[in-house]
Interface confidence: low
């Protein structure tokens, strides 16, 4: 009924995100772009600045219901492939040409910005069909906090806390070390507890990248890294 919760897509601020809208139809007319069109609209979460709406240049497109306050056209592809949207067209908002020919009208945000959060509504007009997709994008901030912070000395301890601003807990947490992402397990030198990693006695060998991967029940995962600095024996 009305007020039904929209499916939620999570994104990590600064990472790419895919907003799905697909027919998965193998027999889509290859001339789709000459005869059909796509409109993606965004209604930012309350509290976000509302961008200036663009002139809609999609002649021949179905006119979506009167936009709610703050809703604007992010991107539209009119019949013939003419693109329009918020001016200037934001390069981080993309539709993939190859995908359109396969019936995939998904929007890519490369990267996701905090201001991208909110409701998204796509209307796709095909020669003999009209498809609509709706979802809610939530953009979370990832961080790794070290206590104590700053440069460490030999035999100091440090506690790393990996966090992402999402209300539910991750279903799994994996820690790794170094550019090669060598997995870190519980040992006398590493104590793992959920999103925390304790190094009780650091050495110069511990300098460098430490990271975690948080995985959530919907399959979304976020990778966070921290550069640890440990002074040598000088």
């Amino acid at each position: 009924g009305p007020g039904k919760e929209l499916p939620v897509v999570w994104a990590q601020e600064g990472a790419p995100v895919h907003l799905p809208c697909s027919l998965k139809s193998p027999n889509l007319d290859p001339n789709f772009l000459r005869r059909g069109g796509v409109i993606w609209q965004h209604q930012p979460d309350s509290g976000q600045p509302t961008p200036i709406p663009a002139l809609d240049l999609h002649q021949g497109m179905p006119s979506p219901r009167q936009p709610a306050p703050g809703r604007y056209t992010v991107l539209s592809v009119a019949p013939g492939g003419l693109r329009s949207g918020r001016q200037p067209l934001h390069p981080h908002v993309q539709l993939e040409e190859r995908g359109l020919q396969r019936g995939d009208f998904s929007l890519w945000l490369r990267p996701a910005l905090r201001t991208d959060a909110g409701e998204y509504h796509a209307t796709v007009r095909l020669p003999n069909r009209a498809l609509s997709c709706s979802l809610r994008l939530r953009v979370g901030q990832a961080s790794m906090i070290a206590s104590p912070s700053g440069v460490l000395k030999l035999s100091d301890w440090v506690l790393l806390n990996c966090s992402f601003s999402r209300p539910d807990r991750p279903v799994s947490v994996h820690w790794f070390q170094g550019q090669n992402r060598v997995p870190v397990y519980n040992s006398p030198r590493h104590f793992l507890a959920e999103t925390f990693l304790l190094l009780p006695q650091v050495s110069p060998l511990d300098s460098g990248t430490w990271g975690c991967v948080l995985t959530y029940r919907d399959g979304f995962n976020v990778s966070i890294t921290y550069n640890l600095k440990v002074l040598g024996l000088e």
Epitope: P7, C21, S22, K24, S25, P26, L131, C133, S134
Partner: nanobody, 121 residues
């Protein structure tokens, strides 16, 4: 045993409205993509509208876009097709169907018996 039972058909004048219902038993409609099809005499069955199980994706035939609205009430395990501004060419037997496929491009597994809609002055 799965059953889909349509109701709400009847005779209506051009420009009038009807609301078709599809009551499901033996399956949870909110876990399926639901479609409304119609078949006019001497014509092939065609997909009129479909709603993905998330309720976030709807799809309409061009001929009914803006006039028909598909919806679902999960608490009643029932789907609906609200038909406004009816035309003579909308006269057909209307069937509801359900599929487990992600989109309604896959085959529909379950079908109702149909309800007749006649638009005539």
């Amino acid at each position: 045993q799965v059953q889909l039972v349509e109701s709400g058909g009847g005779v209506v004048q051009p420009g009038g409205s009807l609301r078709l219902s599809c009551a499901a038993s033996g399956l949870t409609l909110s876990q399926y993509t639901m479609g409304w099809f119609r078949q006019a005499p001497g014509k092939e069955r065609e997909l009129v509208a479909a709603i993905h199980w998330t309720s976030s994706v709807t799809d309409y035939a061009d001929s009914v876009y803006g006039r028909f609205t598909i919806s679902r009430d999960d608490s009643k395990n029932t789907g609906y097709l609200q038909m406004n501004s009816l035309r003579a060419e909308d006269t057909a037997v209307y069937y509801c169907a359900a599929t487990h496929y992600y989109t309604h491009r896959g085959p529909f597994d379950y079908w109702g018996q149909g309800t007749l809609v006649t638009v005539s002055s």
